[in-house]
Interface confidence: medium
């Protein structure tokens, strides 16, 4: 159910492209293709190519993305395209001008003087943005989300986008300055990962990040469990970045116990993040118990 055919508008296409990209990434990183049949990988890559080609139809002259060409471009959607395409660069041929043009647009058009990224045209499919939905800490959450995307595109785009390092620094400054005031576990987790990527999650900030965990194994807010899976996945990525392997096992165990295999309405972010985090875990912490993730993969009937 994770290998699906992407289709629809610029948002629906990304919803459809997400599980396939992350499934291939996960199975590549964890070397589990034999379990599912190596021949299935090629079919999955074809679907990713299809999703990529379709997404280009929603790229605007400014290099940003929107649900429709005539709709105002979305900061979140453009950052998410950057995030997914940055991961897919190792899977299919992606034009660096497409990817880095989007990065440039985010920095030049949507970053405020204090480093904050602003959204002027929210996505139609609000279910796809995960824990950012109805988040009263929007400046922090969105800035962290965009910053993570920029950092994932850094190696590819640094030469093409001169302002990228400065933009990353500025966004990091904003997150660091406001981190201690955060109330929501979700925002603590996503901003924590963004700061950990920069080597700036330390001292009182690190303490806040760690003590926000419930029972030392999850980053949880009241409400949707999907958001807690997403938040805890960000937190796991932060812990792996910090090389805090004492804290890692209970978090991985909790994520595994959720038996969350992705897919379904509103699952875009949780799916992407949980598999990205667990792939990173298996890569970074190979000595820890192997995770028995029964990832079911199905190619659509032709």
């Amino acid at each position: 159910h994770l290998i699906v055919t992407p289709s629809g508008c610029g948002e629906q296409n990304m919803i459809g492209m997400t599980p396939t990209v992350i499934a291939v990434h996960y199975l590549d990183e964890t070397e589990q293709w034999e379990k599912f049949g190596l021949e299935k990988r090629q079919g999955a890559l074809e679907l990713i190519k299809k999703g990529y080609t379709q997404q280009l139809a929603f790229r605007q002259p400014s290099s940003a993305f929107a649900a429709f060409v005539k709709r105002a471009p979305s900061t979140w959607l453009t950052a998410y395209v950057v995030k997914v395409f940055s991961l897919a660069v190792n899977l299919i041929a992606i034009d660096s001008q497409v990817l880095c043009g989007a990065v440039k647009w985010l920095i030049l058009e949507k970053q405020k003087p204090d480093g904050v990224f602003q959204e002027d045209a929210p996505v139609i499919h609000q279910e796809m943005i995960g824990g950012l939905r109805n988040n009263n800490e929007k400046d922090m959450a969105l800035t962290a989300f965009v910053l993570i995307s920029l950092q994932e595109a850094k190696d590819i785009c640094e030469e093409q986008v001169n302002s990228l390092p400065g933009s990353i620094t500025k966004a990091g400054d904003f997150l660091e300055a406001n981190y201690m005031n955060l109330q929501r576990s979700y925002t603590v987790a996503i901003a924590g990962y963004a700061l950990a990527q920069m080597g700036r999650l330390k001292g009182p900030l690190l303490n806040k990040f760690l003590t926000t965990a419930k029972d030392k194994n999850r980053w949880e807010d009241p409400g949707k469990q999907l958001y807690n899976v997403e938040a805890t996945s960000y937190a796991l990525l932060a812990l792996l970045q910090l090389k805090d392997f004492d804290f890692v096992p209970p978090v991985v165990r909790w994520l595994n116990e959720q038996r969350y295999y992705g897919g379904g309405y509103g699952s875009t972010q949780a799916t992407f993040m949980v598999f990205q985090a667990l792939a990173q875990y298996q890569k970074d912490a190979p000595d820890h118990q192997e995770l028995n993730l029964d990832v079911s993969l199905q190619l659509p009937s032709r």
């Epitope: 030049l108 058009e109 970053q111 405020k112 003087p113 204090d114 300055a177």
Partner: antibody, heavy 111, light 112 residues
Framework: EVQLQQSGPVLVKPGASVKMSCKAS????????MNWVRQSHGKSLEWIGV????????SYNQKFKGKATLTVDKSSSTAYMELNSLTSEDSAVYYC????WGQGTSVTVSS | DVVMTQTPLTLSVTIGQPASISCKSS???????????LNWLLQRPGQSPKRLIY???KVDSGVPDRFTGSGSGTDFTLKINRVEAEDLGVYYC?????????FGGGTKLEIK
């Protein structure tokens, strides 16, 4: 020659709003952030906020959030600041700075 | 918010003599990009402020070389090596590292 030309002095009643302008010339308007600063009579300077003329992104001093609104018109190289719900406390000279400084706009709030 | 403390409040100097103004910040002004955003302004009587120095020690074009800025972290100094009549006015330091930007209270330079 670099110039920031600010609009003239205003006298307004309490509760009213005022919108002042700052027209830039002699340099590339979008190349520098535009700061707005307040100076109450005989006092020091107080930072209100900043706008990026390239994309209109704004950042405010918490104290002035809801009081000041910063905008720009790239086509005329002009920055604007609107102040609302004015009280006598808002009587001051308001400067734009980019890092050049305008001559200031004097705002007097009086009934 | 970062507090900027300037001393002295008033400085009376004879023309041709040196003058020195101190500015201390409550937090380090070294930004994560490695730069220190500390500026000095001069506001002459009845005029708007004018920037003299930025990034601690870089002198703006058109500013006489008798003005020098120095310092790092939290301690900064503006020096005028030979005061001239046109230097009278109020000097302000302000920081551009942290949000919100903050100014010192000002130092009034008087000619003896």
């Amino acid at each position: 020659e670099v110039q920031l030309q600010q609009s003239g002095p205003v006298l307004v009643k309490p509760g009213a709003s005022v919108k002042m302008s700052c027209k830039a010339s002699g340099y590339t308007f979008t190349a520098y952030y535009m700061n707005w600063v307040r100076q109450s009579h005989g006092k020091s300077l107080e930072w209100i906020g900043v706008i990026n003329p390239y994309n209109g992104g704004t950042s405010y001093n918490q104290k002035f959030k809801g009081k000041a609104t910063l905008t720009v018109d790239k086509s005329s190289s002009t920055a604007y600041m609107e102040l609302n719900s004015l009280t006598s406390e808002d009587s001051a000279v308001y400067y734009c700075s980019s890092p050049y400084w305008g001559q200031g706009t004097s705002v007097t709030v009086s009934s | 918010d970062v507090v900027m403390t300037q001393t002295p409040l008033t400085l009376s100097v004879t023309i041709g003599q040196p003058a020195s103004i101190s500015c201390k910040s409550s937090q380090s002004l070294l930004d994560s990009d490695g730069k220190t955003y500390l500026n000095w302004l001069l506001q002459r009587p009845g005029q708007s402020p004018k920037r003299l120095i930025y990034l601690v020690s870089k002198v703006d074009s058109g500013v006489p070389d008798r003005f020098t800025g120095s310092g790092s972290g939290t301690d900064f100094t503006l020096k005028i090596n030979r005061v001239e009549a046109e230097d009278l006015g109020v000097y302000y330091c302000w920081q551009g590292t942290h949000f919100p930007r903050t100014f010192g209270g000002g130092t009034k330079l008087e000619i003896k």
